[in-house]
């Protein structure tokens, strides 16, 4: 079958998920497409533990995550509920800042140099992190 029980080559396993860390930059949409073609999605941060893990691997570099607010409320790409979930915004963020001169506000979230989150223009070429969950069924004991 297509069940994934271990991480692909060059991916890092952590807490039953696999992570891939880019070393180049892409616009958010291109990063998102890249992850989907790998059967994954842009990273969805659900806990402080996961935040620390990702932060450790990306270092002090602006890096896209799978969070956007293009259609109103903030949304995680995998459907994880934003309102009740983990958040780690920088103080006074997100601010949908128009002062960058591009106009139109900021609709995609990224890790900043200190790991906390900021909203920014989606077409900026930042690094990104893909995540895919190891098959949950493989955690269950075999049926007798």
């Amino acid at each position: 079958g297509s069940e994934r029980t271990c991480c692909p080559v060059n991916w890092v396993e952590h807490e039953r998920s696999c992570y891939w860390f880019s070393r180049s930059g892409k616009a958010w949409a291109d990063a998102d497409n890249y992850c989907r073609l790998e059967d994954a999605h842009l990273v969805v941060v659900t806990s402080w533990e996961e935040q620390k893990f990702v932060q450790h691997h990306i270092g002090p570099v602006n890096t896209w995550m799978g969070l956007h607010d293009q259609n109103g409320p903030w949304k995680w790409v995998d459907g994880t509920d934003y309102e009740t979930g983990f958040k780690n915004w920088r103080p006074e963020q997100p601010d949908d800042w128009y002062g960058h001169g591009l106009g139109g506000g900021e609709d995609c979230a990224h890790f900043t140099d200190d790991g906390r989150w900021n909203d920014d223009v989606c077409q900026r070429p930042y690094r990104w992190v893909c995540e895919t969950e190891l098959d949950k069924a493989s955690q269950e004991p075999p049926l007798l």
Epitope: A29, N33, Q70, L102, G105, C108
Partner: antibody, heavy 119, light 106 residues
Framework: QVQLVESGGGVVQPGRSLRLSCAAS????????MHWVRQAPGKGLEWVAV????????YYADSVKGRFTISRDNSKNTLYLQMNSLRAEDTAVYYC????????????WGQGTLVTVSS | SYELTQPLSVSVALGQTARITCGGD??????VHWYQQKPGQAPVLVIY???NRPSGIPERFSGSNSGNTATLTISRAQAGDEADYYC?????????FGGGTKLTVL
Amino acid sequence: QVQLVESGGGVVQPGRSLRLSCAASGFTFSSYAMHWVRQAPGKGLEWVAVIWYDGSNKYYADSVKGRFTISRDNSKNTLYLQMNSLRAEDTAVYYCARDLGLGYFFDYWGQGTLVTVSS
Amino acid sequence: SYELTQPLSVSVALGQTARITCGGDNIRRRNVHWYQQKPGQAPVLVIYRDSNRPSGIPERFSGSNSGNTATLTISRAQAGDEADYYCQVWDSSTGVFGGGTKLTVL
């Protein structure tokens, strides 16, 4: 509200050139990638070209590569499509469309301008 | 190049549910978007990124994507839903549309 208005269409002979324009209003034009999409009479939609919000990247469909050039003037809130070496198969309604930036889709479209290539 | 396959036509009885499919190799790995086009009008985005509805689009419109098929579902079909519907993806820096499906509401 968001408005996209195409102009510049008309009847042109094969091998000749035409430049289409798309005037944008109601949003900050300089923030968005923009596309041209065309539709031949009675046929389906065909993507033509895209240009990044700052003009830094441009991509084209194979069918127009080397003949069409997409450009923009953010100071004039206008998108352009320069069409050279036109062929009969380029006959279509040409739409400009705005890209939201979240996966290359088109949330607002103009009403289109008809280009007819005929001798 | 990537290809998207749609049925030429789909019919649905008034008030019933219409399903329009869009086939592509491992399409689940791609963001699929759907447009509605009525005669003489420009297309309108009805679903983006597989299942998201733009503001102003009725909840009757929904989308899904798995395996080799993406599906646009229109529940409680109305006469005003009669139109052509196109799926679309992005592949290798190129926009790709399906051939379109004519929805007829009986």
